[in-house]
């Protein structure tokens, strides 16, 4: 079984978070701002 240090906010530390993509220029043609995924 996992000890407590394997968990943060009740989730396994290795779980990637998925931010919503940000499009600063709104309705103009663009790509999303890149955000690093946390581990």
């Amino acid at each position: 079984s996992y000890s407590m240090e394997h968990f943060r906010w009740g989730k396994p530390v290795g779980k990637k978070r998925r931010p919503v993509k940000v499009y600063p220029n709104g309705a103009e043609d663009e790509s999303a701002e890149a955000f690093p995924l946390e581990f």
Partner: antibody, heavy 115, light 110 residues
Framework: QQQLVESGGGLVQPGGSLRLSCAAS?????????ICWVRQAPGKGLEWIGC????????YYASSAKGRFTISRDNSKNTLYLQMNSLRAEDTAVYYC???????WGQGTLVTVSS | DIQMTQSPSTLSASVGDRVTITCQAS??????LAWYQQKPGKAPKLLIY???KLTSGVPSRFSGSGSGTEFTLTISSLQPDDFATYYC????????????FGGGTKVEIK
């Protein structure tokens, strides 16, 4: 110029279902964007419903939306959908689709749940 | 689930006033916070993303600050066009219900 246009709102009885559409223009949704649904009850604040990654088709929902609401896409029509089931009076709201975190939002479509 | 607590809910101010709105997250959200302005009958407009980055075309009197759990939107000198409702939103993690809005702050004329 990119644009999102919602449709499909209207009056529905409690327990009924409704499918809202969000037609995208000026960009190709299959390229892989986050398109999200947000609602606003009359005189109330904004509530996030969920998002779809239009590239992968992966969907993400608020806890309150899981089970009753389903987000999908039709790349051939460049359109996103919000399927709403088992509707209740408290689902009465203006429903918006939006491109991720941006100023690109639709004009909203009003859903009224009432008998 | 991430909760966003926004205060105050209503703010009465005059043209030229410095206005501050705060948003508190129930857990750390790094700098993944946006601020929106909404006027009656209209869709929200993105003002600030990444806690402090101004969207193109937004006047420099708007500024955002903070990271972790405490965030602030400041209007340095309130203009007539600024009377509206403002919302914060986190976008930290949509796979874990992490795109929640704050309850909103209505900025009204004193």
């Amino acid at each position: 110029q990119q644009q999102l246009v919602e449709s499909g709102g209207g009056l529905v009885q409690p327990g009924g279902s409704l499918r809202l559409s969000c037609a995208a223009s000026g960009f190709t949704v299959s390229s892989g964007y986050d398109i999200c649904w947000v609602r606003q009850a009359p005189g109330k604040g904004l509530e996030w419903i969920g998002c779809i990654d239009t590239g992968s088709g992966n969907t993400y929902y608020a806890s309150s939306a899981k089970g009753r609401f389903t987000i999908s896409r039709d790349n051939s029509k460049n359109t996103l959908y919000l399927q709403m089931n088992s509707l209740r009076a408290e689902d009465t709201a203006v429903y918006y689709c939006a491109k991720g975190i941006s100023s690109l939002w639709g004009q909203g479509t009003l859903v009224t749940v009432s008998s | 689930d991430i909760q966003m607590t926004q205060s105050p809910s209503t703010l009465s101010a005059s043209v030229g006033d410095r206005v501050t709105i705060t948003c508190q997250a129930s857990q750390t959200i790094s700098s993944d916070l946006a601020w929106y302005q909404q006027k009656p009958g209209k869709a929200p407009k993105l003002l600030i993303y990444a806690a402090s980055k101004l969207t193109s075309g937004v006047p420099s009197r708007f500024s955002g600050s903070g990271s972790g759990t405490e965030f602030t939107l400041t209007i340095s000198s309130l203009q007539p066009d600024d009377f509206a409702t403002y919302y914060c939103q986190t976008y930290y993690d949509i796979s874990d219900d992490g795109a929640t809005f704050g309850g909103g702050t209505k900025v009204e004329i004193k």
